[in-house]
């Protein structure tokens, strides 16, 4: 099983910080994470270093390291938060397509874990969610609308309370397709 350094499940840094993530395995290892700027990758046999000297809110996300040659398929992960006071959300996709009754993950990642208590999901232009919308939130993954319905095909925004005011993410379009 590969091991990531730093050896913490979460890392919180400020914008502009230098971040170094190292993964060590028995064989060659590979990184997987959110598509974001500024990363450089250096691999040396059984070790791989991912680094940036200018972290931005877009680097927020979960970085997973796998060992392709491992028959057990083990992996290790670390979640990086780049807490930008002006950017509470890092949206990984602006369109999500699911079939009816599947869970729909709206991937807006919180850039500062402290804000978790004040998050909510709204429809664009501040409209409330449709009645009976059952959703949950994970700061690592975003909002999940459970057992999505066709009628919930809407444009959504993630909202975070910062200094008493609501700050919205860019919109995410949810398309819920009927199962034929």
């Amino acid at each position: 099983i590969p091991v990531i350094e730093p050896s913490v499940p979460e890392l919180v840094v400020k914008p502009g910080a230098t971040v170094t993530l190292r993964c060590v395995g028995n064989g060659s290892v590979e990184w997987d994470g959110p598509p974001s700027p500024h990363w450089t990758l250096y691999s040396d046999g059984s070790s791989s270093i991912l680094s940036t000297n200018n972290a931005t809110f877009q680097n927020t996300g979960t970085y997973r390291c796998t060992e392709p040659g491992d028959p057990l398929g083990g992996s290790a992960a670390i979640h990086l938060y780049v807490k930008d006071p002006a950017r509470p959300w890092n949206v990984l996709a602006q369109e999500v397509v699911v079939f009816e009754d599947q869970d729909a993950l709206l991937p807006c990642l919180l850039t500062d874990p402290v804000l978790e208590a004040g998050v909510s999901l709204v429809r664009v232009r501040g409209r409330p969610l449709m009645r009976h919308t059952n959703y949950s939130f994970s700061p690592w993954h975003g909002f999940t609308i459970h057992r999505a319905k066709f009628i919930q095909s809407q444009d959504y925004q993630c909202s975070a309370l910062m200094g008493g005011r609501k700050v919205m993410s860019i919109s995410i379009r949810l398309k819920v397709q009927k199962v034929i």
Epitope: I1, P6, S7, L11, A17, A76
Partner: antibody
């Protein structure tokens, strides 16, 4: 509110065994990495062992001084972490703290005291 | 293993003064350093993580700095509740070693 409560400390003879327990509440225990840290006047704060979450294959790590003698384990259904200590030595004496790892050792229990003496 | 050398071991200061505690790692730990405060008879409490980030609820008179192998914790305008022991610790792999501690006493 995050709460960690250790139990199981006491007096034990050199070569003996002891099992410490830590009951956790106030957070999603199954997602957490849990560690044991001990403290003595001679050694200061000393990291002992770690067990990671199921997502991290419940991987375990140990300080060299306890490897082969101590075993860390967890029961996610009981939100508890344990430290089984065998072949105890006088230098294992100290206060044992259960901690949760997030961005550091974010939360600590109140500690339980182990004394290894004849 | 990475060794953490903390200095000074003890410090006698007055309320209102500014103090700096330093911690040196035996190799580059890439800013993966935490600082803890421990009051007599109590458990340690996280003060700073990732070298410069204050933990939730920590007053702004505390600040962490440093990179590579050299790190420091600064306390501006010491308050009576700041007296106690301070420890650094690295998170660059295992074992996660602590510094030897700095005891802050009232002059």
């Amino acid at each position: 509110e995050v709460k960690l409560e250790e139990s199981g400390g006491g007096l034990v003879q050199p070569g003996g065994s002891m099992k410490l327990s830590c009951a956790a509440s106030g957070f999603t225990f199954s997602d957490a990495w849990m560690d044991w840290v001990r403290q003595s006047p001679e050694m200061g704060l000393e990291w002992v062992a770690e067990i990671r979450s199921k997502a991290n294959n419940h991987a375990t790590f140990y300080a060299e001084s306890v490897k082969g003698r101590f075993t860390i384990s967890r029961d996610d259904s009981k939100s508890s972490v344990y430290l089984q200590m065998n072949s105890l030595r006088p230098e294992d004496t100290g206060i044992y703290y259960c901690t949760r790892v997030k961005v550091g050792f974010d939360n600590w229990g109140q500690g339980t005291t182990l004394t290894v003496s004849s | 293993d990475i060794q953490m050398t903390q200095s000074p071991a003890s410090l006698s200061v007055s309320v209102g003064e500014t103090v700096t505690i330093t911690c040196r790692a035996s190799e580059n730990i890439y800013s993966n350093l935490a600082w803890y405060q421990q009051k007599q008879g109590k458990s340690p409490q996280l003060l700073v993580h990732a070298a410069t980030n204050l933990a939730d609820g920590v007053p702004s008179r505390f600040s962490g700095s440093g990179s590579g192998t050299q790190y420091s914790l600064k306390i501006n305008s010491l308050q009576s509740e700041d007296f106690g022991s301070y420890y650094c610790q690295h998170f660059w792999g295992t074992p996660r070693t602590f510094g030897g501690g700095t005891k802050l006493e009232i002059k």
